[in-house]
Interface confidence: low
C-alpha cells in the first residue's frame, strides 16, 4: 500500500517518510516507513537518480521531469492564456511553516492560493513550495533549464484540484493530475526583499527535520514580475515515485536573488545514509538530472505581447527592465592592441544578430584609474567606418577597461561587448574566476574523506615546466590528498595579487556584476615591459553537478543577466537561444574551432611549454596559435563540450585581473570551472570535486574568462 508522499521525504531511521498533515489539528505526523517502507533515495551515490528506477518503476518512464526546454521547438498553444491567480497577493498567515525534509526545504502553505487558466483542468489549490539549488556561488541548481541554461535556484509550487480531492496527498497517492509551477531564481546584485521571510526561515531549518513558522510573505512577490511568458508540458514528480501526473508551468522569467541570500540555501544540512551509517552533510545539488523529452511537446503561452522581446532580454536582464530592449547581440571579436608606448587600438566586429537594423554607430567606452579615482570616457564611431578606435595618452600604470556597444535607431542599444582589460607594465596575469571568500570552513562540507575545508594557503603547481604560484581561495576544498589537478581552484599569480593590494589572508569575494568602485592600480606590480591583454566576459558557465547521471546541457551560465535593475547587460557572449545546431553553424561561419572538436574527450590534452605566452607586443599568444579563441567550460555532466549559448566561441585571449577587495563583503564566486590541465586524457568519467573552486590554466589550452560589470555610477545610457 502506498503511503509515500514524494513531496516531503524526511529521513527517519533510514527511510524516507511522508509528511501528512493531521487535518484535525496542526500537528504533523511523520509516518515512519519501516517494514512496508518506501525506498530510501538520494541525489547522489548508491541511492542516486540512476538507481531510483529500481525501487520506483515510474522513474524510468517516458514522460519524466525535469527537462531542458528548447524555446525554438516550443509551440505556441492558443489554449495557454493568462494565469488567473487568486489569493497570491495576500500576506501569508502565521501558520505557514517551513521544513527541512532532508531532500529539500518545503514551505507548507496554510492559506488559500488558487490558480486556473494555463490549460489546467480546473481551479487548482497551492499546497506547498519546494526549492532546488546547487552547491555554491550561484552554481547551477535548477532542475529545469531553458535552452540548456540552468539557474542557481528553482522554486516549485505544487497544486492539486480540490474539486476532485480532499487533499494533495490523496491526489498523489491516487496518481491523479497535479499542477506545478517552476520559478527560476537568478543572481542579482541586490537582496530581493520579497525573499526575506524565506531566507529568514531557512536560517531556522538549517538541520534536517527542523521546522519553523515563517514571517508573513506575499506569494505573488516570489513569482516573476511578468507571468505572461511560460512553458507548459506534462511530466512527473522530480523525486521518487516520479509519478507522471504533473502539469508543469515553467516561467520563462526569473526572480532575482542575491549571493548573500543564496548562502542561506547552501547552509542547509541533511542526513545521508551510507551503509547503515548516517552522516550529516550539506544539502546541496538537490536536483534530478534532466530527462528526455521523448514524444512530448512543450508549449508556450499565447499571452499577447508576453514573448515580444527576444529571449536575450531575460537571459541577460532577469529583471525585465527597459535595458532589456536590445537591438542586437553584442559586438564581437573585441581586441585591444598597443600601437606604441602611449597608444592603444581597440577593434571589434559587428554583432552577429541585429534585431532592429540598422546599426547607426558604435559607442566605445573605457575607464581607468588614476590617483585613486575612476575615470571614464565614451565616444562614438560611425558604423560605416573601420571598426577600430585609437586611445592615445595611455598611462603606463593604469588598468583600462574597454567595451563597445552598438547603437541602432531610436537610441536602441546592443548588449555590451566583452569587457577588455589592459594593463601596461605587468608580466604576471591573474587567470581564472573571481576571487572568492576564504576563511569560511563551514561554507562547504567535505565531499569525501580526503577533503577538508581550508581557509587559505599557497602552493606551486607546474605544468610543462612552467611554474604557477597560486593562492588557494575557495569556499570549498583544498587539493585532495590524491594530488589530482582537478581539485585546484584558482590559479593566481602571487605577484599580481600583491600588486593589487591582496596579502595572503582572507580575501573578500566580489560579485560578477559590480565593477570595482576603484579599479586596482598596479603601482606595486612587477614593472616589466610586456603588455598583456586581458579579456573578461559576463557570460559564465554554470557547472553541472558532479554526479549528474544524464548528459544534460547545463553548461550555460547561471549568472548571465545578474544586473542591477537599470543596467544594461554587459554579456560579451552569445547567449541567445542557439541550440547545438545553431552553435555549430556559427562555428563554421566564424571559422572557430571549438575545444570539443579540437580535443576529443578521450584524447590526451597536449601541454607544450610556452615560455613566450605574454611576449613583447602584448597580444601575441602561444607560437603556432593565432589566438586563444575559445573559453570552454568543463562539461560537468559528461555531455556536450561545445561553447553553448552561454559562451562566445569568438573570445580572444581571456585572462582576468581580479576585482579589488572592497569594504562590502559579497558571498559570490564565479561558478565557471574551466578545463584543467592534465597529464592524462580527460575521460567522460572525470569530474571535479563538487565544491572545488580552484582553476588552473594550461597555457597550451583555452583560457578562462571571468566577469566584470558596471555599477550605477558612470553607466553608459
Amino acid at each position: 500500500v502506498l503511503h509515500y508522499v514524494v513531496c516531503f521525504p524526511a529521513l527517519t531511521e533510514g527511510y524516507v517518510g511522508a509528511l501528512h498533515e493531521n487535518r484535525h489539528g496542526s500537528a504533523v505526523q511523520i509516518r515512519r516507513r519501516k517494514a512496508s517502507g518506501d525506498p530510501y533515495w538520494a541525489y547522489s551515490g548508491a541511492y542516486g537518480p540512476e538507481h531510483w528506477v529500481t525501487s520506483s518503476v515510474s522513474c524510468g518512464g517516458r514522460h519524466q521531469s525535469p527537462i531542458d526546454i528548447l524555446d525554438q521547438y516550443a509551440r505556441v498553444g492558443e489554449e495557454y492564456q493568462e494565469l488567473q491567480l487568486d489569493g497570491f497577493d495576500n500576506e501569508s498567515s502565521n501558520k505557514t511553516w517551513m521544513k527541512n525534509t532532508g531532500k529539500t526545504v518545503a514551505i507548507l502553505l496554510k492559506d488559500d492560493y488558487f490558480v486556473s487558466g494555463a490549460g489546467l483542468p480546473g481551479r487548482f489549490k497551492a499546497e506547498k513550495v519546494e526549492f532546488h539549488w546547487g552547491h555554491s556561488n550561484g552554481s547551477a541548481g535548477s532542475e529545469h533549464s531553458i535552452n540548456g541554461r540552468r539557474f542557481p535556484v528553482e522554486m516549485q509550487i505544487f497544486f492539486y484540484n480540490p474539486d476532485d480531492f480532499d487533499s494533495f496527498q490523496t491526489a498523489i497517492s491516487e496518481n491523479r493530475i497535479i499542477g506545478a509551477m517552476a520559478i527560476f531564481f537568478q543572481v542579482s546584485p541586490r537582496d530581493n526583499s520579497a525573499l526575506d521571510p524565506i531566507i529568514h526561515g531557512l536560517k531556522g531549518v538549517v538541520h534536517h527535520e527542523k521546522e519553523t513558522f515563517l514571517d508573513p510573505f506575499v506569494l505573488r512577490d516570489l513569482l516573476p514580475a511578468s507571468l505572461g511568458s511560460y512553458y507548459r508540458y506534462t511530466g512527473s514528480l522530480t523525486t521518487p515515485p516520479c509519478s507522471e501526473i504533473v502539469e508543469w508551468i515553467v516561467f520563462r522569467r526569473p526572480v532575482p536573488i542575491s549571493y548573500h541570500q543564496l548562502e542561506a540555501f547552501y547552509s542547509i544540512f541533511t542526513t545521508e545514509q551510507q551503509d547503515h551509517v548516517k552522516s550529516v552533510e550539506y544539502l546541496r545539488n538537490n536536483f534530478r538530472p534532466q530527462q528526455r523529452l521523448h514524444d512530448r511537446v512543450v508549449s508556450k503561452s499565447a499571452v499577447r505581447d508576453s514573448w515580444n522581446h527576444d529571449m536575450t532580454d531575460f537571459l541577460e536582464n532577469p529583471l525585465g527592465t527597459e535595458a532589456s530592449k536590445v537591438c542586437s547581440s553584442p559586438p564581437i571579436h573585441m581586441k585591444v592592441q598597443p600601437l606604441n608606448q602611449t597608444a592603444l587600438q581597440v577593434s571589434w566586429s559587428q554583432p552577429e544578430t541585429i534585431y532592429h537594423p540598422p546599426i547607426m554607430n558604435y559607442m566605445i567606452s573605457y575607464s581607468w584609474t588614476k590617483n585613486e579615482d575612476e575615470k571614464e570616457k565614451t565616444f562614438t564611431k560611425d558604423s560605416d567606418k573601420d571598426l577600430k578606435a585609437t586611445i592615445s595618452h595611455v598611462s603606463p600604470d593604469s588598468l583600462y577597461l574597454f567595451r563597445v556597444q552598438a547603437v541602432c535607431r531610436n537610441d536602441m542599444r546592443s548588449d555590451f561587448s566583452q569587457t577588455m582589460l589592459f594593463q601596461a607594465n605587468t608580466t604576471r596575469i591573474f587567470q581564472g574566476t573571481r576571487i572568492v571568500k576564504t576563511g569560511v570552513p563551514t561554507a562547504s562540507p567535505a565531499s569525501s574523506a580526503d577533503m577538508a575545508p581550508i581557509s587559505s594557503g599557497s602552493s606551486t603547481w607546474t605544468s610543462s615546466g612552467i611554474p604557477f604560484s597560486f593562492v588557494s581561495m575557495a569556499t570549498g576544498m583544498g587539493p585532495s590528498s590524491s594530488g589530482s589537478q582537478a581539485t585546484v581552484a584558482s590559479v593566481v599569480t602571487s605577484t599580481l595579487l600583491a600588486g593589487l593590494g591582496f596579502g595572503g589572508g582572507g580575501i573578500s569575494s566580489f560579485p560578477s556584476t559590480v565593477w570595482p568602485t576603484r579599479l586596482p592600480t598596479a603601482a606595486s606590480a612587477s614593472k616589466q615591459a610586456a603588455r598583456p591583454v586581458l579579456a573578461t566576459t559576463e557570460a559564465l558557465a554554470s557547472p553541472g553537478p558532479d554526479g549528474d547521471s544524464s548528459p544534460t546541457k547545463d553548461g550555460e551560465g547561471t549568472e548571465e543577466g545578474e544586473k542591477d535593475e537599470k543596467s544594461e547587460s554587459e554579456d560579451g557572449e552569445r547567449e541567445h537561444e542557439e541550440d547545438g545546431e545553431k552553435d555549430s553553424e556559427k562555428k563554421e561561419k566564424s571559422g572557430v574551432t571549438h575545444a570539443a572538436e579540437e580535443r576529443n574527450q578521450t584524447e590526451p590534452s597536449p601541454t607544450p611549454s610556452s615560455p613566450n605566452r605574454t611576449a613583447e607586443g602584448g597580444h601575441q599568444t602561444i607560437p603556432g596559435h593565432e589566438q586563444d579563441h575559445t573559453a570552454v567550460p568543463t562539461d560537468q555532466t559528461g555531455g556536450r563540450r561545445d561553447a553553448g549559448p552561454g559562451l562566445d566561441p569568438d573570445m580572444v585571449t581571456s585572462t582576468q585581473v581580479p576585482p579589488t577587495a572592497t569594504e562590502e563583503q559579497y558571498a559570490g564566486s564565479d561558478p565557471k570551472r574551466p578545463e584543467m590541465p592534465s597529464k592524462k586524457p580527460m575521460s567522460r568519467g572525470d569530474r571535479f570535486s563538487e565544491d572545488s573552486r580552484f582553476i588552473t590554466v594550461n597555457p597550451a589550452e583555452k583560457n578562462t574568462s571571468g566577469m566584470i560589470s558596471r555599477p550605477a555610477p558612470g553607466r553608459m545610457e
Epitope: V1, L2, H3, S56, V57, S58, H63, P121, G122, P162, D163, D164, F165, D166, T170, S173, E174, N175, R176, I177, I178, T234, P241, E244, I245, V297
Partner: antibody, heavy 115, light 111 residues
Framework: AQSLEEFGGRLATPGTPLTLTCTAS????????MSWVRQAPGKGLEWIGT?????DAYYASWAKGRFTISRTSTTVDLKMTSLATEDTATYFC???????????WGPGTLVTISS | SFVLTQPASVQVNLGQTVSLTCTAD??????ASWYQQKPGQAPVLLIY???SRPSGVPDRFSGSSSGNTATLTISGAQAGDEADYYC?????????????FGGGTQLTVTG
C-alpha cells in the same frame, strides 16, 4: 512485460455474491490506483470503481452499495452482491496511470448471471 | 450526470485520415483519454491527457482537444484500425470521483 489477469468469473444465479480477483505481473499493484471496468455483451465500457494506493475507493453511482473494491499488496478484489441478469458482462481489471487514464487492461473475465 | 457523446459509427477509406470526436458539457476542464478495442480483446490505451501517446502506439494516432470536444485523429487508416474507439474522462469531486466512458464509435475501414 507488465500485465494483469482477472479470476473468478463464472455463471451465477441472480442474488448470488461473487468476488473477482485481479493479480499483476511485472509491476507492483500497490503503487497504482486500480479500477474495475465492465462491458456487457455488445455494449460499451462502463466504469465500476477505483481503489487508490491507500485503499480509499470510489464508485460509480449505480455501483455503490452493491460493489466493493478492496486490495492487498498483491491483489485487487471486486466483491459483487445482489447480482442481476443485467450485471452479465466481461469484467476488466485496469491499472490507472498518467492521471485519469487506464494504461494496462487485463483480458477480462466473463460473469454470467442467469436463472 | 456527466455524459460523453461519441458518434456511433464512422467510415473511412483505406489510407485516408479520419477524426473521431467526443463531446461533453465541461470537457474543457477535463482530460480525455482514448481506447481502441478490437472484437474479443481488451481495450488498449491510445491517447491520454488529450494529446499524449503511450510508447508503442503508432504516431498515426493523435489526440487533440478544443473547447468541449476531444478528437482522436487517425491518419493513413489501415485495415487493422477497424475497431471500436472509446473516449473517457473523469468527473466529480472528493469522494464522489467518477470516471465516465463515451458510448464508443465503431470505425469501419473500407476499400
Amino acid at each position: 512485460a507488465q500485465s494483469l489477469e482477472e479470476f473468478g468469473g463464472r455463471l451465477a444465479t441472480p442474488g448470488t455474491p461473487l468476488t473477482l480477483t485481479c493479480t499483476a505481473s511485472g509491476f507492483s499493484l500497490g503503487t497504482y490506483s486500480m479500477s474495475w471496468v465492465r462491458q456487457a455483451p455488445g455494449k460499451g465500457l462502463e466504469w465500476i470503481g477505483t481503489i487508490g494506493g491507500r485503499g480509499d475507493a470510489y464508485y460509480a453511482s449505480w455501483a455503490k452499495g452493491r460493489f466493493t473494491i478492496s486490495r492487498t499488496s498483491t491483489t485487487v478484489d471486486l466483491k459483487m452482491t445482489s447480482l442481476a441478469t443485467e450485471d452479465t458482462a466481461t469484467y476488466f481489471c485496469v491499472r490507472e496511470n498518467y492521471g485519469y487514464a487506464f494504461d494496462i487492461w487485463g483480458p477480462g473475465t466473463l460473469v454470467t448471471i442467469s436463472s | 450526470s456527466f455524459v460523453l457523446t461519441q458518434p456511433a459509427s464512422v467510415q473511412v477509406n483505406l489510407g485516408q485520415t479520419v477524426s473521431l470526436t467526443c463531446t461533453a458539457d465541461t470537457l474543457s476542464r477535463r482530460y480525455a483519454s482514448w481506447y481502441q478495442q478490437k472484437p474479443g480483446q481488451a481495450p488498449v490505451l491510445l491517447i491520454y491527457r488529450d494529446t499524449s501517446r503511450p510508447s508503442g502506439v503508432p504516431d498515426r494516432f493523435s489526440g487533440s482537444s478544443s473547447g468541449n470536444t476531444a478528437t482522436l485523429t487517425i491518419s493513413g487508416a489501415q485495415a487493422g484500425d477497424e475497431a471500436d474507439y472509446y473516449c473517457a474522462t473523469s468527473d466529480g469531486s472528493g469522494s464522489s470521483y467518477q470516471c465516465v466512458f463515451g458510448g464508443g464509435t465503431q470505425l469501419t475501414v473500407t476499400g
